[in-house]
Interface confidence: low
Amino acid sequence: MATLEKLMKAFESLKSFQQQQQQQQQQQQQQQQQQQQQPPPPPPPPPPPQLPQPPPQAQPLLPQPQPPPPPPPPPPGPAVAEEPLHRPKKELSATKKDRVNHCLTICENIVAQSVRNSPEFQKLLGIAMELFLLCSDDAESDVRMVADECLNKVIKALMDSNLPRLQLELYKEIKKNGAPRSLRAALWRFAELAHLVRPQKCRPYLVNLLPCLTRTSKRPEESVQETLAAAVPKIMASFGNFANDNEIKVLLKAFIANLKSSSPTIRRTAAGSAVSICQHSRRTQYFYSWLLNVLLGLLV
């Protein structure tokens, strides 16, 4: 089968599976809402055991020299059935294997020269990145692990020739502000590539990223905040210089709000991010003083 055909087949299969999964999750949520309004039905069959999500791999995104530091493991993922509960176990594992194989097929073929020469390549790369990020939140840890590796492999292979597209796809996932694992996967990778954004694109990226970072700072998941705290210094080192005073203050206020969190992790990550934002702003001393005054105000 031609490379392009294989790719499209894998795309379609993965996409339809992920859509089914999302529909099932929505149905389950609707059922739960209905159950809250009705007398309780007989107990459902027990859900599958929770799978703790492994943290991102310690291997770096780039061949050398800087590996992305691994955030600590997040809490276990939700015990959402990835297929209807009455399906036989054998069928479940087959679909998991299929998803792993589809990821690997996409991964191998998207870096193939024959696909790179296709006029559709930019679009295909966008779909591939979207699917890998989607699979980063798969219910099965094996699928997540392969999706994580595929992201690394594709970025490593294509960053010389297709960096702007890769950056754009990661940015789109951050903007989406979706599942924690997918968001984290995009966030730390975007941060790793931020220093490679062309100077003329830095200001547009900054303007678009600011609301995303502000929104992400409001996420309740500690794992997201850990990843955000690791990403902010790298993002700000690249784009901080392009921010005006007002933009820096908006971003600082978002993290200052987190200093009141009941979670020590969120307080710690917020403090680190706030310092980093000041450090990489145009007026470092001014913002350090501004931050200090705000913090003293919180104490009074």
Epitope: P55, Q66, P70, M145
Partner: antibody, heavy 119, light 107 residues
Framework: EVQLVETGGGFVQPGGSLRLSCAAS????????MSWVRQAPGKGLEWVSD????????YYADSVKGRFTISRDNSDNTLYLDMSSLRAEDTARYYC????????????WGQGTLVTVSS | EIVMTQSPATLTLSPGERATLSCRAS??????LGWYQQKPGQAPRLLIY???IRATGIPDRFSGSGSGTDFTLTISSLEPEDSAVYYC?????????FGGGTKVEIK
């Protein structure tokens, strides 16, 4: 229970080759990055090489780059280290190590296999 | 490469005493530092990772601290079985590197 068993060590002359194997059991091998770390007699630990879960990413210490190749067979739960152009300074106990929940830290180690390069 | 320097080379203390082992990185490694314990004839054992998190099954007398370039492993009250060589290890940048080790001897 996680077990890592290294084999393949032995005596070899300078310039020779050797293949080390690490048989893994008790965990989902393909889901974890694996590493080789060595220790020269009476000396400290030295990182040699890492390989990611599906084997798409490999990393080497400068001292072995171009001479050593790390690989894995996930169907067989085995990690390999192919060593060529061996030198006297490669003499060491070679440990295979398993990643801790894919965070990079070496949570499980084998007992090591001794490689002696001498004429 | 990042050079990890451990001090002292040897530490001789009595049971019940507090041991403080130091590890310095030649450049900032954030908190991506681990500590391993190795007893004679045995493989190393992970004690602390991410600078301060105790690995599974490690007694709470072991604690880690520090970030950036300066790190400390503290054994709050030495036990005879703590006699070993302790290595620090950075996973911040490739190539990965270990410190030269600190030998802890119990009088």
């Amino acid at each position: 229970e996680v077990q890592l068993v290294e084999t393949g060590g032995g005596f070899v002359q300078p310039g020779g080759s050797l293949r080390l194997s690490c048989a893994a059991s008790g965990f989902n091998f393909g889901s974890y990055a694996m590493s080789w770390v060595r220790q020269a007699p009476g000396k400290g630990l030295e990182w040699v090489s890492d390989i990611s879960g599906i084997g798409s990413n490999t990393y080497y210490a400068d001292s072995v780059k171009g001479r050593f190749t790390i690989s894995r067979d996930n169907s067989d739960n085995t990690l390999y280290l192919d060593m060529s152009s061996l030198r006297a300074e490669d003499t060491a106990r070679y440990y295979c190590a398993k990643d801790r929940k894919r965070s990079g830290w070496y949570e499980q180690w084998g007992q090591g296999t001794l490689v002696t390069v001498s004429s | 490469e990042i050079v990890m320097t451990q001090s002292p080379a040897t530490l001789t203390l009595s049971p019940g005493e507090r041991a403080t082992l130091s590890c310095r990185a030649s450049q900032s490694i954030s908190a991506y530092l681990g500590w391993y314990q190795q007893k004679p004839g045995q493989a190393p054992r992970l004690l602390i990772y991410d600078a301060s998190i105790r690995a599974t099954g490690i007694p709470d007398r072991f604690s880690g601290s520090g970030s950036g370039t300066d790190f400390t492993l503290t054994i709050s009250s030495l036990e005879p079985e703590d006699s070993a060589v302790y290595y620090c290890h950075q996973r911040s940048k490739w190539p990965l590197t270990f410190g030269g080790g600190t030998k802890v001897e119990i009088k």
